[in-house]
């Protein structure tokens, strides 16, 4: 269930895809990745107010219980719903290789 | 990649499964669920320090970028890695029915 996409906190404040430009050094990958040397990291950032992009029944439960017990139960969290793949050239024991990572870049986001 | 399960913040402080007892009223389900009248909700709660139960490459990236830009990039978040199903008896237009929900109770947790 993909619930409301209207953000009650104002434009851009709720859970959505953001892009952060990062070097291999930033990512701690400089010792094993050779290319690309810069990555446009897409990640899910933002608040998850009541029923905003609720991923499933569990997210809806979490919202209800957070309202009741905010000190015990955290609000739902903005995380990737799916990913975009990315190919890296990486060092190996025997030389170099191309490797596709399917779980590297967020494609879209939901609250859970 | 399921990384370290040792919590550097002390026992029970990091991302793990918690159980919260909730009534149908707590969950906002009283108007459509008939049974069970109380649910032992299992959910994922706790901190996600560096590489603790990192779900995938994206979680590892998020940890690195959070360390660099804590005001921009949030730390990974404790969310369900899988779910346990639960059967509810619910009201329908024509009477009652049994319905299995596959995404209601967290089974185990990871950081993402």
């Amino acid at each position: 269930a993909r619930n409301g996409d209207h953000c009650p906190l104002g434009p851009g404040r709720c859970c959505r895809l953001h892009t952060v430009r990062a070097s291999l050094e930033d990512l701690g990958w400089a010792d094993w990745v050779l290319s690309p040397r810069e990555v446009q990291v897409t990640m899910c950032i933002g608040a998850c107010p009541s029923q905003f992009r609720a991923a499933n029944m569990h997210a809806q439960i979490k919202t209800s219980l957070h309202r009741l017990k905010p000190d015990t139960v955290p609000a739902p969290c903005c995380v990737p719903a799916s990913y975009n793949p990315m190919v890296l050239i990486q060092k190996t024991d025997t030389g170099v290789s191309l490797q596709t990572y399917d779980d590297l870049l967020a494609k879209d986001c939901h609250c859970i | 990649a399921r990384n370290g399960d040792h919590c550097p913040l002390g026992p029970g402080r990091c991302c793990r499964l918690h159980t919260v007892r909730a009534s149908l009223e707590d969950l906002g389900w009283a108007d459509w669920v008939l049974s069970p009248r109380e649910v032992q909700v299992t959910m994922c709660i706790g901190a996600c320090p560096s590489q603790f139960r990192a779900a995938n490459m994206h979680a590892q990236i998020k940890t690195s970028l959070h360390r660099l830009k804590p005001d921009t990039v949030p730390a990974p978040c404790c969310v369900p890695a899988s779910y346990n199903p639960m059967v509810l008896i619910q009201k329908t237009d024509t009477g009652v029915s049994l319905q299995t929900y596959d995404d209601l109770l967290a089974k185990d947790c990871h950081c993402i």
């Epitope: 290319s35 446009q40 793949p85 990315m86 190919v87 596709t100 | -």
Partner: antibody
């Protein structure tokens, strides 16, 4: 095996724009970067720019900055290169190629001949 | 911009004999990670370029082992151990250390 299939030849007037497409046939871009290069008649190769996953922002050669726009539509697995303010010196075969970052350009399109003539 | 200079401009070869092409860069292509950001491409008559060697010395998938790349810093060599008739075309070196990516002027290999 993925192939890059480019749009057909174009004849353009000086001052106009051209938009060349590059579609991944038999697959998607699947996490590879897309670079664009051109080759004037009888000349060598010249890199114009490229775009890396998730295909949000492109990197351009300074020479083409402000005149070239590289985009990609993942839903259709198609990359585009638009060159504006065309002049006769832009007459060339334009190639797209997939790579990892800017290197390892292992699959190339068949090329699109763009002729700029009044 | 990094200037890439190839020699010779033209190389007449005898099938079965070795051949060697030189490529010089105006500045070092050796990255601090120990790898040279240099590729070699072959453009056969009437065709698009094809990748032969990447990162200085790594043969691309499907490339015959008669092709080898060597060198470091500013001086690089592409060797063909035994030239075959299908190897004719223009060979280009390309630096990918910094943008703009630049190509050498090309070396035309033809059968004597």
């Amino acid at each position: 095996q993925v192939q890059l299939v480019q749009s057909g030849a174009e004849v353009k007037k000086p001052g106009s724009s051209v938009k060349v497409s590059c579609k991944a046939s038999g697959g998607t871009f699947q996490g590879y970067a897309i670079s664009w290069a051109r080759q004037a008649p009888g000349q060598g190769l010249e890199w114009m720019g490229g775009i890396i996953p998730p295909y949000a922002t492109a990197n351009y050669a300074q020479k083409f900055q402000g005149r070239v726009t590289i985009t990609a539509d993942e839903s259709t697995s198609t990359a585009y290169m638009e060159l504006s303010s065309l002049r006769s010196e832009d007459t060339a075969v334009y190639y797209c190629a997939r790579g990892v970052g800017e290197l390892h350009l292992d699959v190339w399109g068949q090329g699109t001949m763009v002729t700029v003539s009044s | 911009d990094i200037v890439m200079t190839q020699s010779p401009l033209s190389l007449p070869v005898t099938p079965g004999e070795p051949a060697s092409i030189s490529c010089r860069s105006s500045q070092s292509l050796l990255h601090s990670n120990g790898y040279n950001y240099l590729d070699w491409y072959l453009q056969k008559p009437g065709q698009s370029p094809q990748l032969l060697i990447y990162l200085g010395s790594n043969r691309a998938s499907g490339v015959p082992d008669r092709f080898s790349g060597s060198g470091s810093g500013t001086d690089f060599t592409l060797k063909i151990s035994r030239v075959e008739a299908e190897d004719v075309g223009v060979y280009y070196c390309m630096q990918a250390l910094q943008t703009p990516i630049t190509f050498g002027g090309g070396t035309k290999v033809e059968i004597k």
